[in-house]
Structure formats: structure tokens, C-alpha cells
């Protein structure tokens, strides 16, 4: 027989997901001026663009680039200058050093004298000329220019102990998710950092095997739950004249300096105007600070009339992070994202005080994110369109107006293709770019400020379009359901040939940490979608209470109890899923990785018979082997005073008992900086005691995100076996 | 200054209608969300129902919820509260009041419109 | 619902004397409490809100104290204008219903 024209199209292999086959780009200008963008070719030059008059030229050479092996490149403001950066050697989550040369544009050759040292741990030039501040070995030194000797500003620095200008484990992963704590003034005449003292910080110490004879031992500073904490002050240098004053320390607020406390970030207003943010360590109370430079004093004075404080009564302040404020031209007013009176997150305008804050948007939806304010609009991103949450699109408000009138920029550009957009402005917004993450295949385009129209189409992913056009992809849908009173919003994918009167074998895919999202509207070729492509199984991924945009009163349920409602939740769709008659009860899976882990091992450990089999990647077991920052934010102290009992309660390990019916495979890398392997080990530790059988896998030398190609495949390779196993899938 | 100046008042019998008007001034009206809270003769403050001021989400305490309708004009700068199918027990001052922007606190007040409801 | 009781319903002060007012909540309130006047006649006045925050023109005479389920106004010296009703209102969720406690009656002795 022969197949018909239809047939033709061939089933993802798990091949094609390991080898990336059909991985998609974006395209995000680096902006440097209002009509002026630099970008990467394929070809790895660095083309300078002007949208205005259309001239495109090669401002850096790929051989200049491969002629250091430079990956990443900085223009100078003054455009006389271009760091190029090699040797790029990964630390934590967002934390590198890497070798940096500089480049004269001038000279088309590279400075030579003074040349920096390495590795270095960050580097940035000032908003304005070719300052150069970077951090070597825990300080901070400042170029006046990148041919001049470099000035040391810090000398406090000291591995493992004082870090000035960089984050420490913790600040860095839970609390500013940067590389750097340093910021220019907008003049570029005053540098901001902040110093972290990890002194009496509790040491994770853990092997690293390598090839040696006898393994390493990495020891990080890591305040697990209730432990000591980071100390952090603010100081700020006048880089002018660095050697005159010194460093200046900025005040902490009374109202928080009166108990242990976070600096959250820090936000330049104007050249002499700087506002920071603090955070109590019970994180419900936020303070933000706007303090001014007093020439006299050669201070920085921050009164208690600019403090503005944020508070949640039913949860935690701020979303993941409390909020950073986008001020106006005034340098004294500004826009703010926070929960309204109904518990949405909504845009809000501080003229004086934030009793009298003017609420810019609202709604049973939420405002997530304001890109940019300029003389007359705000832009923002918010899931309000059609009521689904796990979309975004652009919204541009005219502050001019009163009331202020509001545009959606985005919602019917390519409404089935697009309906995840994040967006990239130039410094007044004259232009931006458009990513959109799907549902449809990404695309980037380019438009005008004024008047949103599309200029040009930065990239629209046509090879990978073409490359699928013989793929047999599943179908996704997005959907909600009902339970008592609460909504659920889920994806589910659905193998290619699905018909509704067959059985499928379900497998729930779990993150469900709180402010997480999971059912968003974006294009992926992954894992899961070749399970549902290539194995016929039906994936669905449902937000349960506790992740985000969706308000408080759903944000907050899990707060001060994680590891109750998330896993209820993700039992209630189990079933709902089941009612819908195409799901063979016999067959349901979950798996999840970290937060997903945790709740994938709980909901395995419900003792509700609903799973066959379920697998747990670097899961946390217990909230008090986490970091402070996180496990606190959540359910307060592991103390008899406050909340040690949840902490008990919560853990994988008091469930032990309640694996014995069901199949479980426990993986994780033993150089896992962030859940460290302490976590699977007492899971494996307690499953010993109780006697109960399980499976598991750890990957030797490798952090978090199991990410190296080897250990990558062998790890989705094995998760497959057990999957298809379990499933009674034949190979 | 903050002023609201409530009217409307007067005397109904049990089932009929009647609508309670507040004209507001002082403030940017359309910012800030407003409230109708009530006083029986010789009795305590009770909370009747609430408009946000952006977004218009109404709210009404159990007592009136399905007879009352809450509702604002911003153009007019008035807030309103439409009654029907009063009941005796309806009989009170009537204020109209300003929330605060961040909290449901009342920061100004009207000086109020009586409401009799009787056979 | 979170009910709020004030005590006493009636309290007989002379000008001069210091008067203290309770309200205790059902629940836990935070510190999310305001305090009103209402004089004989007249429309309730805001005095403190957030448990301790005077409101705008209030005199330093009026103070507020208290968190989570029992709160108190203080009037230290007692004014011949200050003889009225004074009631305490939650707001602890800003989703209604607020409440407001049954009052208490400050009079001339």
C-alpha cells in the first residue's frame, strides 16, 4: 500500500530534541542612541544599523572578534572604544569571569598598557565617555580611561568572605538575579555598589570529582533557612575625584535597619538622585528610599519623607522580587507595579506619598512588567487580552491624558501566531523591537515609537519553519478548569493522530512554585513535545494556586504552607483530566525538576493511588536546606515561634512511607550548587529506612541544570526509558 | 477642598425605589474609589457598598446585595446608589464617602441624606 | 466576616482626663484600623488610620496603638469638643465587607 500524501510527515525523534534541532532565534537590537542599534550577524561581525538612514556597516570584524576568541562584545558611549570578552567561564546562574581586551575603534588596534587584569568578575563601562568599572578578586577598580592606570576604590575584598560590587551566592540567585551589584549615575560621575559580608555565613561544602586523585571541595557561603544572612551596605564613590572622599555610605531606613534586612536595588533617578530599595527578612515590608547628594554635607541624605513604604497583608511584598520603580521626568513622581485593593498586580503613579498613589491600570488581570516612561507614554506588558494569563502582550498608555488613555500594541499584530511578546525599546523610545514567543514560531520586528507601525522584520525563524514543515508536531491547547470556586488554567499536548474515543497514557509535567508560570502561550519543541509526538502520550501542565498573575488571593494561598496546595491542585486536574474519558487511569505519570521535583515526589507521596510512576530531577526535600532568601519569603522561619512545624511537615522525607506503590526515580547532579544533593540524599536516606524501592540517577560533577551535552543526554535518555517502562511503551 | 454633598433622600414605603446622588469636588473624582455607608437612627456605622475608581468593580454588603446598585459618573463627578425594593429596615443617614487610594479606609465623609422607609 | 468590639459602650470622662478607648477584632487585623469621631448631628470624621497614623488636622492630643486583634485610642487631655462617639473599622483585606465596631459613646461626667 502506499502511503498516502498526508503520511508523509515523520514523528520528533528524541534525537532531534538533544541535538537542537529545532531550537528558534530572537533578535534583540543592542541599542545606542534613539535611531541607532549594534548586532551580531551569523557570521559573528558586529554590524552598527540606523533605522533612519537605512546605513548598515561593519563597526567590529569577526577577525578582530576570533582573533582574541571573543563571545560577547561592549561599545563605549563615546563609540571610541569596544571591550571584547573571551574565556568565558561560568560560576553560578548568572555569574562568569571571563578575559576582556580592549579595543580601539579609532586606532583599529588593541590598547595596550595597563591592561586588565583576570579573569575578572565584571566589567561595564559608564553611561556616558569610556570610564571602565570592573571587579577583580572581590573589589572594585575604576579606569578614568581604558589606556590610564586603574584606580582600586575597594580593598575590603576577600574570597568567600567581602564582595563589593557582585553578589554573593544567595543576593545573586534569590534577590537581584544579576552578576553585578554596581550601577552608574545616568553622567556617569557617581558609581553605586553595594558590599556583601559573608563572614558569618554558614559554608555548603560539597565535592567536585574531577580527574584528580582526590576530588575538590567546593565551599560557598550559603545561608540555608534561619540561617545568618548576608551583611549589605550601599556605598557610593564619586569616580571624578575618587581619591578625595571616598567611598560615601548610603542610610539604611530606621524602620528597617531595625531588624535583619535585604537591600533589594537600586535605581538611579538623575546624576544626584539615587533610589534604593530595602526589604525586611520577614519580606512582607518593602521600603523604597530616594535620597539626594548634599554637595555640603559630601553625603547622601535620604529623608523620611521619601520613603515610601509597600506592605502585603496576605503574602509576601512584590511578586518573585518586590518591583522596581520607572520614574518620570520630573525625577520625583514615578510608576510603580504593586497589588491593588482587590489583590492585582496594577501600575500605580507616586506623586507623594504611597497613601495617594493613583492607580494607572486594574482589573482581574495583571500588569507585569513597564519596559518604559517617556515625556508622553508609559509602556507596559500585562495578560489582560481575552482574559488568558499565560499571555503578554504590549500596552502603550498616553500619560498626557486624563484620564490616561490605553492602546494594546500588540494583541492583533499576528494574533494566532503571537500572543507572547516581550519588547526592547531605544533610549526615548523613538523605536523598539517585538520578540514574540509564539504560540506560533517566534518573531522579531522593528517599529516606530510614535506610531507603532512595522518597519522591518528583524527575524521570522523561516529555516526552522521550513525544517518542521515534515515534522508531525502535537497539538497544544490552552485551556481552563473549574473546581470549587477556583479556575485552573492548563496546556495539555495532544499526540499528533489524537482521537478523543482512545486511551492515552498522561504524563503531568510540574513546576508549581509560587509566582512561577507554567501555561504560557510560546512555541517550544522539546522534551515533552517529542513524548507526545513520537510515543503517543497526552502532557499537560496546569497552574495550580501559588503561581502568578492571577492575583493575590490565588498567589497568596500557598504562603507560609508550600508542598499543600500545589500538589492538591495538580491532583483536582489529574482527575478533571481523567473525567474527560480519554486518559487510561492506569497510565499517569508526573514529573518535575527543582521546585517541580518537590512537588512531583508530594503529589507521587499523596497515598491517592492517581500515579503509576513519577520522576524528580534535583527536587528540594526540605525548606530548611534551602536558601534563606527563598524558603523565608514563603513560609517565614523554621523556628517553634513562627513556622518550624510547616517546615516539618513539608518535607519528602515524612512521606517516605507512601512511595511504596508507586515507581519513583530520583535524579540529581552532585555539584548542584543551588538544591544541594543533601536534598536527594536524605530522600534516598529516608526510602532506605522505610524500605521502599525506587530508582535513581545522579549525574557526577554537574549543578542544577544537568546541562552538559553528555550529561544532558543521558539524562533525557534515561527519563525516556523509565517513562516508556512505565507506560508499557515498546523501544 | 474635599467636598460630597449627598441628596436624594426622603420618604418611601417598604418595596419601592429610590436613588441617593453624592456630587463630589476637590478631588480628581475618577481616581479614587468611593463608598455609601449607613446609620440607622440612634445606631452604629454600617458599610453598605464600594466602587473602585478605576475599573468601576462594585461591592455590596449582604444586607442589600441584589437591591441596591452602586454605580459613578465620572463626567458628572457623581457617585450614585440606586435602591429598590426597600425595606423598613433600610431606614438611615446615608453617607457618601471617599476611600483612601491604598486602603479602605474612609478619609472624607458627606454630611449625609435620611432615607425612610415606611407604611 | 471579622467582628469588632469596642468597650466600654459609654465612657463618663471630665475635660481633662485621659480617655482610652478599646476595640478588639475577631481576627487578626494587622495593623489595618482606623479610628472615626461622629459628633451629635454630623458626619463621621477619620482620626487615625493604620492603627497609630494621625490623619491630616488631627491635634497630637489623639493617639493610636495596637496590632493583630486589640487596638486603642488614647485622647490624652480631654477637650470640651472631643465629647462623642467614637468608632474603630477594619480594613484588613480591602475586599469587603468592612466592618465597623458597635462605638463607644465619650461624655461629660
Known amino acids: 500500500l502506499r502511503p498516502s500524501r498526508g503520511n508523509t510527515k515523520r514523528a520528533l525523534t528524541l534525537k532531534d530534541i538533544l541535538n537542537g534541532t529545532f531550537s528558534y532565534k530572537t533578535y534583540f537590537p543592542n541599542w545606542i542612541s534613539e535611531q541607532e542599534y549594534l548586532h551580531q550577524s551569523e557570521d559573528d561581525n558586529i554590524v552598527f544599523y540606523n533605522i533612519e538612514t537605512r546605513e548598515s556597516y561593519i563597526i567590529l570584524s569577526n577577525s578582530t572578534m576570533k582573533s582574541v576568541n571573543a563571545t560577547d562584545y561592549g561599545l563605549s558611549p563615546d563609540r571610541q572604544f569596544v571591550y571584547l570578552e573571551s574565556d568565558y567561564s561560568k560560576l553560578w546562574r548568572y555569574s562568569y569571569t571571563a578575559t576582556y581586551y580592549i579595543y580601539d575603534l579609532q586606532n583599529g588596534e588593541f590598547v595596550r598598557g595597563y591592561e586588565l587584569p583576570r579573569p575578572i568578575q565584571y566589567l561595564c563601562w559608564s553611561p556616558v565617555g569610556s570610564k571602565l568599572a570592573y571587579v577583580y578578586q572581590n573589589n572594585i577598580y575604576l579606569k578614568q580611561r581604558p589606556g590610564d592606570p586603574p584606580f582600586q576604590i575597594t580593598y575590603t575584598g576577600r574570597e568567600n568572605r567581602i564582595f563589593n560590587g557582585i553578589p554573593d551566592w544567595v543576593y545573586e540567585e534569590e534577590m537581584l538575579a544579576t552578576k553585578y551589584a554596581l550601577w552608574w549615575s545616568p553622567d556617569g560621575k557617581f558609581l553605586a555598589y553595594v558590599e556583601f559580608n559573608d563572614s558569618d555565613i554558614p559554608i555548603i561544602a560539597y565535592s567536585y570529582y574531577g580527574d584528580g586523585q582526590y576530588p575538590r571541595t567546593i565551599n560557598i557561603p550559603y545561608p540555608k533557612a534561619g540561617a545568618k544572612n548576608p551583611v549589605v551596605r550601599v556605598f557610593i564613590v564619586d569616580t571624578t575625584y575618587p581619591h578625595h572622599v571616598g567611598p560615601m555610605e548610603v542610610p539604611v531606613p530606621e524602620m528597617i535597619a531595625s531588624s535583619d534586612y535585604y537591600f533589594s536595588w537600586l535605581t538611579w533617578v538623575s546624576s544626584e538622585r539615587v533610589c534604593l530599595q530595602w526589604l525586611k527578612r520577614v519580606q512582607n515590608v518593602s521600603v523604597l528610599s530616594i535620597c539626594d547628594f548634599r554637595e555640603d554635607w559630601h553625603a547622601w541624605e535620604c529623608p523620611k519623607n521619601q520613603e515610601h513604604v509597600e506592605e502585603s497583608r496576605t503574602g509576601w511584598a512584590g511578586g518573585f522580587f518586590v518591583s522596581t520603580p520607572a520614574f518620570s521626568q520630573d525625577a520625583t513622581s514615578y510608576y510603580k507595579i504593586f497589588s491593588d485593593k482587590d489583590g492585582y498586580k496594577h501600575i500605580h503613579y507616586i506623586k507623594d506619598t504611597v497613601e495617594n498613589a493613583i492607580q494607572i491600570t486594574s482589573g482581574k488581570w495583571e500588569a507585569i512588567y513597564i519596559f518604559r516612561v517617556t515625556q508622553d507614554s508609559l509602556f507596559y506588558s500585562s495578560n489582560e487580552f481575552e482574559g488568558y494569563p499565560g499571555r503578554r502582550n504590549i500596552y502603550r498608555i498616553s500619560i498626557g491624558n486624563s484620564p490616561p488613555s490605553k492602546k494594546c500594541v500588540t494583541c492583533h499584530l499576528r494574533k494566532e501566531r503571537c500572543q507572547y511578546y516581550t519588547a526592547s525599546f531605544s533610549y526615548k523610545a523613538k523605536y523598539y523591537a517585538l520578540v514574540c514567543y509564539g504560540p506560533g514560531l517566534p518573531i522579531s520586528t522593528l517599529h516606530d515609537g510614535r506610531t507603532d507601525q512595522e518597519i522591518q522584520v528583524l527575524e521570522e525563524n523561516k529555516e526552522l519553519e521550513n525544517s518542521l514543515r515534515n515534522i508531525q508536531l502535537p497539538k497544544v491547547e490552552i485551556k481552563k478548569l473549574k473546581d470549587g470556586g477556583l479556575t485552573f488554567w492548563y496546556k495539555m499536548i495532544l499526540p499528533p493522530q489524537f482521537d478523543r474515543s482512545k486511551k492515552y497514557p498522561l504524563l503531568i509535567q510540574v513546576y508549581g512554585g509560587p509566582c512561577s508560570q507554567s501555561v504560557k502561550s510560546v512555541f517550544a519543541v522539546n522534551w515533552i513535545t517529542y513524548l507526545a509526538s513520537k510515543e503517543g502520550i497526552v502532557i499537560a501542565l496546569v497552574d495550580g494556586r501559588g503561581t502568578a498573575f492571577q492575583g493575590d488571593k490565588f498567589l497568596h494561598a500557598v504562603y507560609r504552607k508550600l508542598g499543600v496546595y500545589e500538589v492538591e491542585d495538580q491532583l483536582t486536574a489529574v482527575r478533571k483530566f481523567i473525567e474527560m474519558g480519554f486518559i487510561d487511569e492506569e497510565r499517569i505519570a508526573i514529573w518535575g525538576w527543582s521546585y517541580g521535583g518537590y512537588v512531583s515526589s508530594l503529589a507521587l507521596a499523596s497515598g491517592t493511588g492517581l500515579f503509576k510512576c513519577g520522576i524528580a530531577v534535583a527536587p528540594v526535600s526540605s525548606w530548611e536546606y534551602y536558601a534563606s532568601i527563598y524558603s523565608e519569603r514563603f513560609m517565614g522561619l523554621p523556628t517553634k515561634d513562627d513556622n518550624l512545624e510547616h517546615y516539618k511537615n513539608s518535607t519528602v522525607m515524612a512521606r517516605a512511607e507512601y512511595f511504596r506503590n508507586v515507581d519513583y526515580l530520583l535524579i540529581h547532579g552532585t555539584a548542584d550548587d543551588n538544591v544541594h544533593f543533601q536534598n536527594s540524599a536524605q530522600i534516598a536516606k529516608a526510602l532506605v529506612n522505610a524500605q521502599v524501592d525506587f530508582q535513581a540517577m545522579w549525574y557526577s560533577d554537574q549543578n542544577h541544570g544537568i546541562s552538559s551535552g553528555r550529561s544532558q543526554n543521558h539524562l533525557y535518555t534515561h527519563m525516556t526509558h523509565f517513562l516508556k517502562q512505565c507506560f508499557s511503551l515498546s523501544d | 477642598d474635599v467636598q460630597l454633598v449627598e441628596s436624594g433622600g426622603g420618604v418611601v414605603r417598604p418595596g419601592e425605589s429610590l436613588t441617593l446622588s453624592c456630587a463630589a469636588s476637590?478631588?480628581?473624582?475618577?481616581?479614587?474609589?468611593m463608598g455609601w455607608v449607613r446609620q440607622a437612627p440612634g445606631e452604629g456605622l454600617e458599610w453598605v457598598s464600594g466602587?473602585?475608581?478605576?475599573?468601576?468593580?462594585?461591592y455590596y454588603a449582604d444586607s442589600v446585595k441584589g437591591r441596591f446598585t452602586i454605580s459613578r459618573d465620572s463626567s458628572k463627578n457623581t457617585l450614585y446608589l440606586q435602591m429598590n425594593s426597600l425595606r423598613a429596615e433600610d431606614t438611615a443617614v446615608y453617607y457618601c464617602?471617599?476611600?483612601?487610594?491604598?486602603?479602605?479606609?474612609?478619609?472624607?465623609w458627606g454630611l449625609g441624606t435620611l432615607v425612610t422607609v415606611s407604611s | 466576616e471579622i467582628v469588632l468590639t469596642q468597650s466600654p459602650g459609654t465612657l463618663s470622662l471630665s475635660p481633662g482626663e485621659r480617655a482610652t478607648l478599646s476595640c478588639r477584632a475577631s481576627?487578626?487585623?494587622?495593623?489595618?484600623l482606623a479610628w472615626y469621631q461622629q459628633k451629635p448631628g454630623q458626619a463621621p470624621r477619620l482620626l487615625i488610620y493604620d492603627a497609630s497614623n494621625r490623619a491630616i488636622d488631627i491635634p497630637d492630643r489623639f493617639s493610636g496603638s495596637g496590632s493583630g486583634t486589640e487596638f486603642t485610642l488614647t485622647i490624652s487631655r480631654l477637650e470640651p469638643e472631643d465629647f462623642a462617639v467614637y468608632y474603630c473599622?477594619?480594613?484588613?483585606?480591602?475586599?469587603?465587607?468592612?466592618?465597623f465596631g458597635g462605638g463607644t459613646k465619650v461624655e461629660i461626667k
Open positions: 466602587i473602585r475608581g478605576r475599573g468601576g468593580s462594585t
Open positions: 481576627q487578626s487585623v494587622g495593623h489595618y
Open positions: 476637590g478631588f480628581t473624582f475618577s481616581n479614587y474609589d
Open positions: 464617602a471617599k476611600e483612601n487610594n491604598r486602603h479602605s479606609f474612609f478619609e472624607y
Open positions: 473599622q477594619q480594613y484588613y483585606n480591602n475586599w469587603p465587607p468592612l466592618t
